[in-house]
C-alpha cells in the first residue's frame, strides 16, 4: 500500500513580510496528480480558499490583491489527488507591515562606533508595544526580538551590541508589534547606518559595503541586560 | 437545483429569541465554510458569522455576544441562534457558502433565497 502523499511546498512572492495594500501570491506547489489544492490559515474558519490547479497541474496561486489585516497570519496548504487529499506543507507565516506609526531607531553613544567597544541601539515607540524587532538588511537571519516580560506595555526596548566587530556594521531598521497578533508590524523605523571604525581587518570600512550574509555576531540571539535571551524571530513564533 | 435552504425566519419581538436553519448539500456542505449575511432596507450586506469545516467561527460585531453559529454534519445543516434581538436586527438572513477568503470579500459561491426575519412589538 501507497504512503501518504508527500506534502506540497507553500511560498510567497515577492516575500512573506508584506507592507498594508501592496498585493501578494502565495504559491502552493504539490504532484501533477493534484486535482484541487486548499489553503488554511490557523485560527480561522477553514477552508481559507481554494483553487483548481495550474497547469501541468503540479501547483496553484492564491491571489492577494491588496494587504490588509485579514491576511496576516500562519498558513498551510494541501492538494487533493485521485488517492485523497495531501500531508500538510510546512506552514508559511505571512506578516504585514504598516499596521502601526513606525518607531524612531538611534544608537548610544552614536552610531559611529569603535571596534571592541559596546553600543545599544534604542527602538523607541509613540505608543507603548509588548514586542520590537531589530532588522538588519542583508544578514542571515535578520530578525531578532526583544518581548516584555508578562505582556507589560513599554515605549522603547534595547538592543547591546557588545564587543563590537566590523560584521556589526550594516544598515538596521526596527518595528514594533502589540503581543496579539506577531503577524501585525509596524511600519519599519528609517533606517540607522552603523559604521564600526578601528578594527585591524577594516579599519575604514565604507558606510555603503555590502553585508556578509556568512554566519557572524549578528546570527546570534542579542541579550538585552535583566531580560531572558530573545532568539530569531521565527523560532520564538512557531 | 436549490442547494441551500433556509428555514426558520418571521416575527418575534424586541428581547426574544429565534433559530435560522440552513439546510445544505453534502457535496457544499464537507467541503466549505457555511455562514449567514443580513441585508436590511437601503443597506449594504453584512457577514452576521460563518463556521469552518474545523468548527471554527466568526461572529459579527454588531452580534457578538447575542448570536452564536454552529453546524450539524450528519444533517448537513447550519444553524444561526439568534438571542436578545433587537429592532435593528430585522433585515433578510441569507445562507451562504464557500472558502473564507470569499466571506471576507462579500462573494461566497453559494447563496440561499433569504428568510425574513421581523423584530417589532
Known amino acids: 500500500q501507497a504512503g501518504p502523499l508527500p506534502k506540497p511546498t507553500l511560498w510567497a512572492e515577492p516575500g512573506s513580510v508584506i507592507s498594508w495594500g501592496n498585493s501578494v501570491t502565495i504559491w502552493c506547489q504539490g504532484t501533477l496528480e493534484a486535482r484541487e489544492y486548499r489553503l488554511d490559515k490557523e485560527e480561522s474558519p477553514a477552508p481559507w480558499d481554494r483553487q483548481n490547479p495550474l497547469e501541468p497541474k503540479n501547483k496553484a496561486r492564491f491571489s492577494i490583491p491588496s494587504m490588509t489585516e485579514d491576511y496576516a497570519g500562519r498558513y498551510r496548504c494541501y492538494y487533493r489527488s485521485p488517492v485523497g487529499w495531501s500531508q500538510p506543507s510546512d506552514p508559511l507565516e505571512l506578516v504585514m507591515t504598516g499596521a502601526y506609526s513606525k518607531p524612531t531607531l538611534s544608537a548610544l553613544p552614536s552610531p559611529l562606533v569603535t571596534s571592541g567597544k559596546s553600543v545599544t541601539l534604542l527602538c523607541q515607540s509613540r505608543s507603548p508595544m509588548d514586542t520590537f524587532l531589530l532588522i538588519k538588511e542583508r544578514a542571515a537571519h535578520p530578525l531578532l526580538h526583544l518581548r516584555s516580560e508578562h505582556g507589560a506595555q513599554q515605549h522603547q526596548a534595547e538592543f547591546p551590541m557588545s564587543p563590537v566587530t566590523s560584521v556589526h556594521g550594516g544598515t538596521y531598521r526596527c518595528f514594533s508589534s502589540h503581543g496579539f497578533s506577531h503577524y501585525l508590524l509596524s511600519h519599519p523605523s528609517d533606517p540607522l547606518e552603523l559604521i564600526v571604525s578601528g578594527s585591524l581587518e577594516d579599519p575604514r570600512p565604507s558606510p555603503t559595503r555590502s553585508v556578509s550574509t556568512a554566519a557572524g555576531p549578528e546570527d546570534q540571539p542579542l541579550m538585552p541586560t535583566g531580560s531572558v535571551p530573545h532568539s530569531g524571530l521565527r523560532r520564538h513564533w512557531e | 437545483e436549490v442547494q441551500l435552504v433556509e428555514s426558520g425566519g418571521g416575527l418575534v419581538q424586541p428581547g426574544g429569541s429565534l433559530r435560522l436553519s440552513c439546510a445544505a448539500s453534502?457535496?457544499?456542505?464537507?467541503?466549505?465554510?457555511m455562514g449567514w449575511y443580513r441585508q436590511a432596507p437601503g443597506k449594504q450586506r453584512e457577514l452576521v458569522a460563518a463556521?469552518?469545516?474545523?468548527?471554527?467561527?466568526k461572529i459579527g460585531d454588531s452580534v457578538k455576544g447575542r448570536f452564536t453559529i454552529s453546524r450539524d454534519n450528519a444533517k448537513n445543516s447550519v444553524y444561526l441562534q439568534m438571542n436578545s434581538l433587537r429592532a435593528e436586527d430585522t433585515a433578510v438572513y441569507y445562507c451562504?457558502?464557500?472558502?473564507?477568503?470569499?466571506?471576507?470579500?462579500?462573494?461566497?459561491?453559494?447563496w440561499g433565497q433569504g428568510t425574513q426575519v421581523t423584530v417589532s412589538s
Open positions: 451562504a457558502a464557500g472558502a473564507y477568503v470569499r466571506f471576507l470579500q462579500n462573494s461566497p459561491d453559494y
Open positions: 453534502e457535496s457544499i456542505f464537507s467541503s466549505n465554510v
Open positions: 463556521v469552518g469545516i474545523n468548527g471554527l467561527t
